[in-house]
Interface confidence: low
């Protein structure tokens, strides 16, 4: 039988005694920045080219003996996980190794930077097909390492990195915290986050997805036919590098944004036991375990969206938090969330020629998050329509008035503290779904987009208050682009999208001792693109 | 994921521009920043990545590195340029005393300086 980790990432249609998905990444080159490797191991012989790049610090300690098997252990295993003959994910991928970690598995930021520069220069000298760079290492937050990753990603390279094994917020580490990098946490055979001694996988909003990372069978550097089991977020990242190689081999023109969206889309959803994560990190951590797509073609018709959380704003009264989409993604909606419930909403605003999502803290609040819904929508023309606070008691409303523009998201922002505490609820008049509605003291922002074949509809789900959580999901074939709460209760902590479900969270009324009139209503905007569907059918 | 103004320790040395007897001083009021790893045991003081502003050419990087060496020598400090970056980021890697940071931050074209730090296999 195949190892558990390969079975886990394989969609059911490929599951057989043999793990043999089509096209094993043969058009893709994977660079590995790690320890030295045993290139004559039968798992990777002829598949990994050892470059002459080496930049490592001296080993610590006077009595350290350089045993080749120890020096090569980490890198050899990872090369095997990516492209090994028997236990590899992308059996057709070719690899190149750079030595940036010494025999103790230690390197430097500067050595890693020089390694990344080496890859960029190699790419310029001899352009090949798609490139994947695997960085199975982590250090403290580094502005310069993140900047270098950003530059390499913008040159068309896909970077995959380990989230880190510190049982901590991945945003505190680099390159895990670089937005352009695909950051991978580790799960085990039971879909539990991996525990490593007293520590374990990192988590949080800087993690893109998880992958198998415990008890992973791969090439051992003790002999050329030996196998060993290793664990860590490096092993998880190696799985994703392999999956990325497979996807890029099938569709070499995929951009980084498209690849990331596909990785997220084809992941197993909501299988991780979140209780392992600290409570305040659960909502920020993606509940996704990487998997290969069920078919190498035909994903193009899908409207892909993902949720991007900002950093925490901090508690100051004027504090704001900003969530940004990747350069070739569209911001289709913007929401906010505060654990204390003290927030002043959110708005979409232009920054450097691109829309960003900004959330506003309120006085006495512990801080807010901005949540951006970032989508792949080719040839989109999106704009934000704003209605200032209304004078009338009817509430504020705004709709998409331009011909051919559809509503993809609603945001509201207010200046008064604790909006809604003394205000009557405002309900949307029926039969007018293509508009955003809010309190009379709030500014309302509608995201309006025009794109070929784009159609959207509004779905609502209201439950009488008090209610801690209300959800509404989009049906099969539709993608959630907007998620917000209808005004009508002062207890709403915020709204955010989890996969294709809109979640509206309210205060735990049992602890606040207060009750609320009306209902807590989650409003989802669900969209699809007939144009993308037609285009993909023509390809078939 | 994390923005560039994210959760990491930042020591900002706000320095008034001084020509130090040389041309090409930075514009008045601009400041370069110094960054180091928030995790103390992982710091590697004595080696610094000097990152220059985005459009800086390789020749300007080399000239800035030489200028740092010359100014340091005038103050009796030895420095070693370990690598000049180009292709991804403009800048250079220098081995020098931390005493020279203030001087280095005043050099023309400097965007920020980061102290080297350790990374680990995961």
């Amino acid at each position: 039988s195949i190892p558990w980790n390969l079975e886990r990432i394989t969609p059911p249609r490929y599951r057989a005694d043999e793990y043999q998905p089509p096209d094993g990444g043969s058009l893709v080159e994977v660079y590995l920045l790690d320890t030295s490797i045993q290139s004559d191991h039968r798992e990777i012989e002829g598949r990994v080219m050892v470059t002459d790049f080496e930049n490592v610090p001296e080993e610590d300690g006077t009595r350290f003996h350089r045993q080749a098997s120890k020096c090569d252990s980490h890198g050899t295993h990872l090369a095997g996980v990516v492209s090994g003959r028997d236990a590899g994910v992308a059996k057709g991928a070719s690899m190149r190794s750079l030595r940036v970690l010494n025999c103790q598995g230690k390197g430097t930021v500067s050595g890693t930077l020089i390694g990344l520069e080496f890859i960029r220069k190699s790419q310029l000298v001899q352009p090949v097909g798609p490139l994947v760079v695997l960085l199975p290492l982590a250090g403290g937050y580094s502005r310069v390492l993140n900047a270098a990753c950003q530059r390499l990603a913008r040159a068309g390279v896909v970077l995959v990195t380990a989230a880190g094994n510190f049982r901590d917020d991945a945003c505190l580490y680099s390159p895990a915290s670089a937005p352009e990098v695909i950051t991978v946490g580790a799960t085990n055979a039971q879909d539990q986050p991996v525990t490593l001694g007293t520590l374990g996988t990192n988590f949080g909003r800087c993690v893109d997805l998880f992958a198998p990372g415990e008890d992973i069978i791969g090439a051992s550097s003790y002999c050329s036919t030996c196998f060993v089991s290793q664990s860590g977020t490096s092993q998880a990242a190696a799985h994703v590098a392999g999956i990325a190689a497979m996807m890029l081999s099938a569709e070499p023109e995929l951009t980084l944004a498209e690849l990331r969206q596909r990785l997220i889309h084809f992941s197993a959803k909501d299988v991780i036991n979140e209780a392992w994560f600290p409570e305040d990190q659960r909502v920020l951590t993606p509940n996704l375990v990487a998997a290969l797509p069920p078919s190498t073609h035909g994903a193009g018709w899908q409207l892909f969206c993902r949720t991007v959380w900002s950093a925490h704003s901090g508690p100051t009264r004027m504090a704001t938090a900003v969530a940004r989409c990747a350069p070739d993604e569209e911001l289709l909606s913007c929401s906010s969330f505060s654990r204390s419930g003290k927030r002043r909403g959110e708005r979409m605003e232009a920054q450097g020629g691109k829309l960003v999502c900004r959330a506003h803290n309120a006085f006495g609040g512990e801080g807010v998050y901005a949540i951006a819904r970032c989508c792949l929508l080719p040839q989109a023309n999106c704009s934000v329509h704003t209605a200032p606070p209304a004078e009338a008691s009817m509430g504020t409303r705004v709709h998409c008035h331009q011909q051919g523009h559809v509503l993809t998201g609603c945001s509201s922002h207010w200046e008064v503290e604790d909006l809604g505490t003394h205000k009557p609820p405002v309900l949307r008049p029926r039969g007018q779904p293509n508009q955003c509605v809010g309190h009379r003291e709030a500014s309302i922002h509608a995201s309006c987009c025009h794109a070929p074949g784009l159609e959207c509809k509004v779905k609502e789900h209201g439950i009488p208050a008090p209610q801690e959580q209300v959800t509404v999901a989009c049906e099969e074939g539709w993608t959630l682009t907007g998620c917000s709460a209808l005004p009508g209760t002062s207890h709403v902590l915020g709204a955010y999208a989890v996969d294709n479900t809109c979640v509206v969270r309210s205060r735990d009324v049992s602890t606040t001792g207060s009750t609320s009139e009306g209902a807590v209503t989650a409003v989802a905007i669900c969209c699809r693109s007939r144009h993308l569907a037609q285009a993909s059918q023509e390809l078939q | 994921q994390e923005d560039e103004d994210g959760d990491y320790e930042e020591l900002v040395l706000a320095l008034r521009s001084e020509e130090d007897g040389l041309a090409e001083a930075p514009e008045h009021g601009t400041t370069a920043t110094f960054h180091r790893c928030a995790k103390d045991p992982w710091r590697l003081p004595g080696t610094y990545v000097v990152v220059l502003k985005e459009e800086t050419h390789l020749s300007q990087s080399e000239r800035t590195a030489r200028r740092l060496q010359a100014q340091a020598a005038r103050r009796g400090y030895l420095t070693k340029i370990l690598h000049v970056f180009h292709g991804l980021l403009p800048g250079f890697l220098v081995k020098m005393s931390g005493d020279l940071l203030e001087l280095a931050l005043k050099l023309p074209h400097v965007d920020y300086i980061e102290e080297d730090s350790s990374v680990f296999a995961q």
Partner: antibody, heavy 121, light 112 residues
Framework: QVQLVQSGAEVKKPGASVKVSCKAS????????MHWVRQAPGQGLEWMGY????????KYHQNFKDRVTMTADKSISTAYMELSRLTSDDTAVYYC??????????????WGQGTTVTVSS | DIVMSQSPSSLSASVGDRVTITCKSS????????????LAWYQQKPGKSPKLLIY???TRESGVPDRFSGSGSGTDFTLTISSLQPEDFATYYC????????FGQGTKLEIK
């Protein structure tokens, strides 16, 4: 200069209500929260609550929640604190104090001169 | 509620003495993001309103003499008067603003 001038001393019977005013001058009234703090004879300081004059938002200490009302009249830059159902335990000097509504400036930099409220039958 | 405990509740000292008053909170007042301790010290003389001396545990309010200094972090804080002056005899209060606002019970500083 910046000043908070409070209304004069009051003598009230148990069960009655008292309304103390605090007139601000020398600064922009809307930019600062107004807190109320009381001090019983020979005792320490006890925080009662605050009002944000710009929005009218209030937050009261648990002990006073049911019987205190804080209001503000922006047009005359005056904050008010009304305490109902008075008992002899409410005999105290009542202070208003301002706090800048920005960042972490969560301290009281200017205080009123105090208003003595005596509750006696 | 956060409880603030000051000690001593009273002390006698002479002009020129160095005096230390301590304040303990029942939970940390350090905001991990801003690295600021939300603690202030106030001075109150008989029949007068309190006066702000120190905020953020160690920042002196403008106009406050530099003989007054604040220190500490987390749950333990100290107000130090390096050389007592006649006008310093008063009652001193610490106050937390980490979660709403609570004052310590006060320390009365008297002339020996």
């Amino acid at each position: 200069q910046v000043q908070l001038v409070q209304s004069g001393a009051e003598v009230k019977k148990p069960g009655a209500s008292v309304k103390v005013s605090c007139k601000a001058s020398g600064y922009t009234f809307n930019d600062y929260w107004m807190h109320w703090v009381r001090q019983a004879p020979g005792q320490g300081l006890e925080w009662m609550g605050y009002i944000n004059p710009s929005s009218g938002f209030t937050k009261y200490h648990q002990n006073f929640k049911d019987r205190v009302t804080m209001t503000a009249d922006k047009s005359i830059s005056t904050a008010y604190m009304e305490l109902s159902r008075l008992t002899s335990d409410d005999t105290a000097v009542y202070y208003c104090a301002r706090q800048y509504d920005y960042d972490e400036d969560w301290y009281f930099d200017v205080w009123g001169q105090g208003t003595t409220v005596t509750v006696s039958s | 509620d956060i409880v603030m405990s000051q000690s001593p509740s009273s002390l006698s000292a002479s002009v020129g003495d160095r005096v230390t008053i301590t304040c303990k909170s029942s939970q940390s007042l350090l905001n991990s993001r801003t690295r600021k301790n939300f603690l202030a010290w106030y001075q109150q003389k008989p029949g007068k309103s309190p006066k702000l001396l120190i905020y953020w545990a160690s920042t002196r309010e403008s106009g406050v003499p530099d003989r007054f200094s604040g220190s500490g972090s987390g749950t333990d804080f100290t107000l130090t008067i390096s050389s007592l002056q006649p006008e310093d005899f008063a009652t001193y209060y610490c106050k937390q603003s980490f979660n709403l606002f609570t004052f310590g019970q006060g320390t009365k500083l008297e002339i020996k």
